[in-house]
């Protein structure tokens, strides 16, 4: 009769699993885009913002030719775990100004956690090692000011959007190579 409902499949089509990861990544990309736009409307950004604790971009036009599934999934998972930490930190330490975005930040965190679980499942199905982050985890202190938390939010959402954008492209490309 097959495995009981809700139990993980023992064997699975990696392309279908990757498809599912692409759909979740696209969905999170759309959510992040929407939230970043909301942030810009409520708190217009004066120029560009960056945070030293955010991961550096892993993909570009130059890396697409040499992409391999293990490396992409491992790096994506590590980077998204870092972004998850930053979103959690924003929700905890962002101050009153960011409380107006709390429902959206909460939903974004839940989606990010869901995507991370999906990537972990995909990696275990492909028998890839669940690598720990290479870079040391930088402790995130409280923002210097209310404006500091807003600048941090712009940087986090902008960086996450860019990471997810490349992730969709990379995963689509890898699907064709499976």
């Amino acid at each position: 009769p097959g495995p009981p409902a809700g139990s993980p499949r023992v064997s699975s089509d990696p392309r279908a699993d990757l498809d599912s990861a692409v759909l979740l990544t696209r969905s999170l990309l759309a959510d992040t885009r929407q939230l970043a736009a909301q942030m810009r409307d409520k708190f217009p950004a004066d120029g560009d913002h960056s945070l030293d604790s955010l991961p550096t971009l892993a993909m570009s036009a130059g890396t697409l030719g040499s992409l391999q599934l293990p490396g992409v999934l491992t790096r994506l998972r590590v980077d998204l775990m870092s972004y998850l930490r930053h979103v959690q930190w924003l929700r905890r330490a962002g101050g009153p100004s960011l409380k107006t975005l709390e429902p959206e930040l909460g939903a974004l965190q839940a989606r990010l956690e869901r995507l991370l679980r999906r990537l972990q499942l995909l990696m275990s199905r492909l028998a890839l090692p669940q690598a720990a982050p290479d870079q040391p985890v930088i402790p995130l202190g409280p923002p210097a000011s209310a404006w500091g938390s807003i600048r941090a939010a712009h940087a986090i959402l902008g960086g996450l959007h860019l990471t997810l954008d490349w992730a969709v492209r990379g995963l689509l490309l890898l699907k064709t190579r499976l």
């Epitope: 120029g47 560009d48 971009l57 570009s60 890396t63 969709v168 492209r169």
Partner: antibody, heavy 117, light 110 residues
Framework: EVQLLESGGGLVQPGGSLRLSCAAS????????MNWLRQAPGKGLEWVGV????????FYADFVKGRFTISRDNSKNTLYLQMNSLRAEDTAVYYC??????????WGQGTLVTVSS | QSVLTQPPSASGTPGQRVTISCSGS????????VNWYQQLPGTAPKLLIY???LLPSGVPDRFSGSKSGTSASLAISGLRSEDEADYYC???????????FGGGTKLTVL
């Protein structure tokens, strides 16, 4: 607000050279791959090439290989297109555009290059 | 001759729904994301749809994209006079190792 501003276009003779610039503002320039595209008068869009965010990788359309070179200076937030051995068919409006993945999410207003004797 | 094929023109009356097609091959549309750009007369192109069906912020949801196999389409519902423009589809091409475009479709609002 993201802004891309091209400059350096003008009239040049066949076989001549020209260098276009694209000044970027309103975003972290060093995080984004950048492209040049072009549009001949009354014609469609054509991709010229892309340079990776750190500047070490470049890809070009076949029609410009060996004649055009894309470079960038991240300290100046500027993208360049060096065009050599220009031909009449290179006459077009040249656009710079930002790439966050597979698409061009912001474009400059364009600069016209006319190759004619 | 463009790598991606679009009808040169399309038209509709205000309020109508119009669809623009874009066909390619497995090396471009079949394996890669499709993007759509709108170019209003005398202006630079603007991103309209990315990753087949996602809308950038600021683009009204009257615009929608879809993809099936090696073809894609752009639909505009509730057509308005300000939608009169050229529309281009685009995708990465694995064989050419570069970005390819359709020839563009001139949309006229009657």
């Amino acid at each position: 607000e993201v802004q891309l501003l091209e400059s350096g276009g003008g009239l040049v003779q066949p076989g001549g050279s020209l260098r276009l610039s694209c000044a970027a503002s309103g975003f972290t320039f060093s995080h984004y791959d950048m492209n040049w595209l072009r549009q001949a008068p009354g014609k469609g869009l054509e991709w010229v090439g892309v340079i990776s965010y750190e500047g070490s990788n470049k890809f070009y359309a076949d029609f410009v290989k060996g004649r055009f070179t894309i470079s960038r200076d991240n300290s100046k937030n500027t993208l360049y297109l060096q065009m050599n051995s220009l031909r009449a068919e290179d006459t077009a409006v040249y656009y710079c555009a930002r790439t966050p993945g597979s698409h061009f999410d912001y474009w400059g207003q364009g600069t016209l290059v006319t190759v004619s004797s | 001759q463009s790598v991606l094929t679009q009808p040169p023109s399309a038209s509709g009356t205000p309020g109508q729904r119009v669809t623009i097609s874009c066909s390619g091959s497995s090396s471009n549309i079949g394996n890669n994301a499709v993007n759509w750009y709108q170019q209003l007369p005398g202006t630079a192109p603007k991103l309209l749809i990315y990753y087949d069906d996602l809308l950038p912020s600021g683009v009204p949801d009257r615009f929608s994209g879809s993809k099936s196999g090696t073809s894609a389409s752009l639909a505009i519902s509730g057509l308005r006079s300000e939608d009169e423009a050229d529309y281009y589809c685009s995708a990465w091409d694995d064989s050419l190792n570069g970005v390819v475009f359709g020839g563009g479709t001139k949309l006229t609002v009657l």
